[in-house]
Amino acid sequence: MAVTACQGLGFVVSLIGIAGIIAATCMDQWSTQDLYNNPVTAVFNYQGLWRSCVRESSGFTECRGYFTLLGLPAMLQAVRALMIVGIVLGAIGLLVSIFALKCIRIGSMEDSAKANMTLTSGIMFIVSGLCAIAGVSVFANMLVTNFWMSTANMYTGMGGMVQTVQTRYTFGAALFVGWVAGGLTLIGGVMMCIACRGLAPEETNYKAVSYHASGHSVAYKPGGFKASTGFGSNTKNKKIYDGGARTEDEVQSYPSKHDYV
């Protein structure tokens, strides 16, 4: 019961996390204009991974996509890549984990197979979460660097009498959404991995030799595929499959898969 709850909760947490990663990736407010030096601006600038926007005094917002690949900073491309990899891995992880859920029965799928799928999806969620956190952190670092560079530029040159104040950018809402979403996906993945341990059969199942001692006579019965000493209660010599060997029916096919301003 606890295993099912842990697995289900892990799935739900990961689902929320991946939805958040997708939302963050699509959001325009990765960086927003810093209003510290100009709190009365009638023109508010903000930028996302895919386009930059300007909200004017009329309330009208104009967004322009980055219609070039080669003209974009390498860091921005890297962040895009990390977020997309995170989304793809998370989506595959969700697909795998749906089939792995203990509460869902699909044919005669063994718990061991579900355990493997749970572990696979858990690892995918962990990597997905790490990708999102890394992507957001790289972007945040880029912002911090640019912020202090533009601050330095503001007070140098032309004797400090610069007419055009360079627009500085600070953290946008998407960064916080991304961090939280990445963290949730990571936590969900860890929960799935924990659930996997509980899903795997508790007792060691032996499928090798079973010895029946009656006085001095020993009955030898071959069973399974590997020779090992059997001390279990498998007195009727039923073959127990633990995932090491599967019939053809048991083999599962796992889902696998502008101008920069």
Partner: antibody, heavy 115, light 113 residues
Framework: QVQLVQSGAEVKKPGASVKVSCKAS????????IHWVKQAPGQGLEWMGY????????NYNLKFKDRVTMTSDTSISTAYMELSRLRSDDTAVYFC????????WGQGTLVTVSS | DIVMTQSPDSLAVSLGERATINCKSS????????????LIWYQQKPGQPPKLLIY???TRDSGVPDRFSGSGSGTDFTLTISSLQAEDVAVYYC?????????FGGGTKLEIK
Amino acid sequence: QVQLVQSGAEVKKPGASVKVSCKASGFTFTSYNIHWVKQAPGQGLEWMGYISPGNGGSNYNLKFKDRVTMTSDTSISTAYMELSRLRSDDTAVYFCATGRGFAYWGQGTLVTVSS
Amino acid sequence: DIVMTQSPDSLAVSLGERATINCKSSQSLFNSGNQKNYLIWYQQKPGQPPKLLIYRASTRDSGVPDRFSGSGSGTDFTLTISSLQAEDVAVYYCQNDYSYPLTFGGGTKLEIK
């Protein structure tokens, strides 16, 4: 087409308040800010502030901040500008304006403050 | 506050001639976010509300004749009427659309010589 229709002329005594309305049509009322501009007789234009019907936010010119209140009623697509503690120098035509670059203006409301 | 200074205060130009009105702001109206200048030009005739001519310093509003053009960047801007028509007699205002409070120039009265 986009239209801003303002309420009629008002005559007020000093110290009183006046509330001018601006009814919008032809566009999504909550998408654009409604700005208010004052023009005293024979004078130039003076921005008073704006109301954002979408979120109720507003921004006032400090010159009017303590006396002006801008509100909106999205159900009837109408913006209001209330000016309190009227003085003789508040005698002016008050315009509401909206759209990109203030593309659309109301016809103006003459407010006369006289004892 | 950004102070908008228009020159001249009044201007008399012959029909068909070029009219030029200048506007200077005390601070730059250039937005580095989209590389645009946030200056607006209006035309106002007696008893009427102002009419938008140019926004973002050089973008003509729809329906505005192409004899009207705006130019300039940073702090210095110009409205040009390439060939003055009788209906162009009006007061012209420039406006800072970059920083609150939004401020207007004092106006330039354009007349026919």
